[in-house]
């Protein structure tokens, strides 16, 4: 029998290679049973996760899962870093794994590196 606890399914050690100036949607997959929990996004600053206030967020529904989406319109160089979503459920806080955004500032790059080039960077591979 499946648990009816809220689950946040951000993949562990996941990352996204994105470009400044582009739009980007960061998704937090949420599994719940009856009542949709309140979900928030935060950005890691060392060991502290700072809640993101006043940002454009939305919900998307799929068959067995909902997604709480953080919109970047557009991505800024300062958006580089790790993010986590958390849910309030029965007075408890459930935290997701963190996911990392690697932002390439197109102003400082002569051309966009390919995904393979991004993946070959040691700081990306072993972050």
């Amino acid at each position: 029998k499946e648990s009816c606890d809220v689950q946040l399914y951000i993949k562990r050690q996941s990352y996204h290679s994105i470009f400044a100036g582009d739009p980007f949607k960061l998704e937090c997959p949420v599994k719940y049973c009856a009542h949709r929990p309140q979900v928030t996004w935060c950005k890691l600053n060392g060991t502290t996760c700072v809640k993101l206030e006043g940002r454009h967020t939305s919900w998307k529904q799929e068959k067995n899962l909902s997604f709480f989406i953080l919109h970047f319109e557009p991505v800024l160089p300062s958006d580089n870093g790790s993010y986590r979503c958390s849910a309030n459920f029965l007075s408890a806080i459930i935290e997701s794994h963190s996911t990392t955004l690697y932002v390439t500032d197109v102003k400082s790059a002569s051309e966009r590196p390919s995904k393979d080039e991004m993946a070959s960077r040691p700081w990306l591979l072993y972050s």
Partner: antibody
Framework: QVQLVQSGAEVKKPGASVKLSCKAS????????AHWVRQAPGQGLEWIGR????????KYDPKFQGRATMTADTASNTAYLELSSLRSEDTAVYYC????????????WGQGTLVTVSS | DIVMTQTPLSLSVTPGQPASISCKSS???????????LNWFQQRPGQSPRRLIY???KLDSGVPDRFSGSGSGTDFTLKISRVEAEDVGVYYC?????????FGQGTKLEIK
């Protein structure tokens, strides 16, 4: 239930390439990682790498970087591993492995594909 | 890379008797999220591996409760309280805290 069905055995010559497939069913392919692990005859298990099917992002053991290429097709729920410049030491059973919602805990294993590299 | 060292490499056990396998990692496997990504896998002859234990001590569904896992940091143990004939095979520890993920070299369990 979760099922990972891998392609059939392959015999290749040294220097050739091989592309293995792993068709997933019974879970949401996009919301997990697909890993590849190999086992040479009579030897232990060796992690090759993993792919995030949702965006194609990969992580490889540096030993395989440049020679192994993992891809995934979310339309057919299939993960692929291509290994190039084959040598006799690549003779092994190759397993695809899925985990529960990207936990990276190697939950579900395919039946394995034997790749034999011989001249 | 993190080196996972298993001992013993083989053991022969009388049915009904206990068995214990040790796994030591070259670095602490405690992740920044507070979890320790240490699993144990069983590979029976001619079969694919299957996970027995994840996150050090959590038993997978369908795994008999005679199997247990313990440990922290760099030292981990798989115990079988009463070995049965169906337990024959090779047991591997595995770490998923650091890239690249690595397995121990395996411990072969035989029945006396």
């Amino acid at each position: 239930q979760v099922q990972l069905v891998q392609s059939g055995a392959e015999v290749k010559k040294p220097g050739a390439s091989v592309k293995l497939s792993c068709k997933a069913s019974g879970y949401n392919f996009k919301h997990t990682y697909a890993h590849w692990v190999r086992q040479a005859p009579g030897q232990g298990l060796e992690w090759i790498g993993r792919i995030d099917p949702a965006n194609g992002n990969t992580k490889y053991d540096p030993k395989f970087q440049g020679r192994a290429t993992m891809t995934a097709d979310t339309a057919s729920n299939t993960a692929y591993l291509e290994l190039s410049s084959l040598r006799s030491e690549d003779t092994a059973v190759y397993y695809c492995v899925a985990d529960h919602y990207g936990s990276s805990l190697l939950d579900y294993w395919g039946q394995g594909t034997l790749v034999t590299v011989s001249s | 890379d993190i080196v996972m060292t298993q001992t013993p490499l083989s053991l022969s056990v009388t049915p009904g008797q206990p068995a214990s396998i040790s796994c030591k990692s070259s670095q602490s496997l405690l992740d920044s999220d507070g979890k320790t990504y240490l699993n144990w896998f069983q590979q029976r002859p001619g079969q694919s591996p299957r996970r027995l234990i994840y996150l050090v001590s959590k038993l997978d569904s369908g795994v008999p409760d005679r199997f247990s896992g313990s440990g922290s940091g760099t030292d981990f143990t798989l115990k079988i309280s009463r070995v049965e004939a169906e337990d024959v095979g090779v047991y591997y520890c595995w770490q998923g805290t650091y890239f690249p993920y690595t397995f121990g070299q395996g411990t072969k369990l035989e029945i006396k």
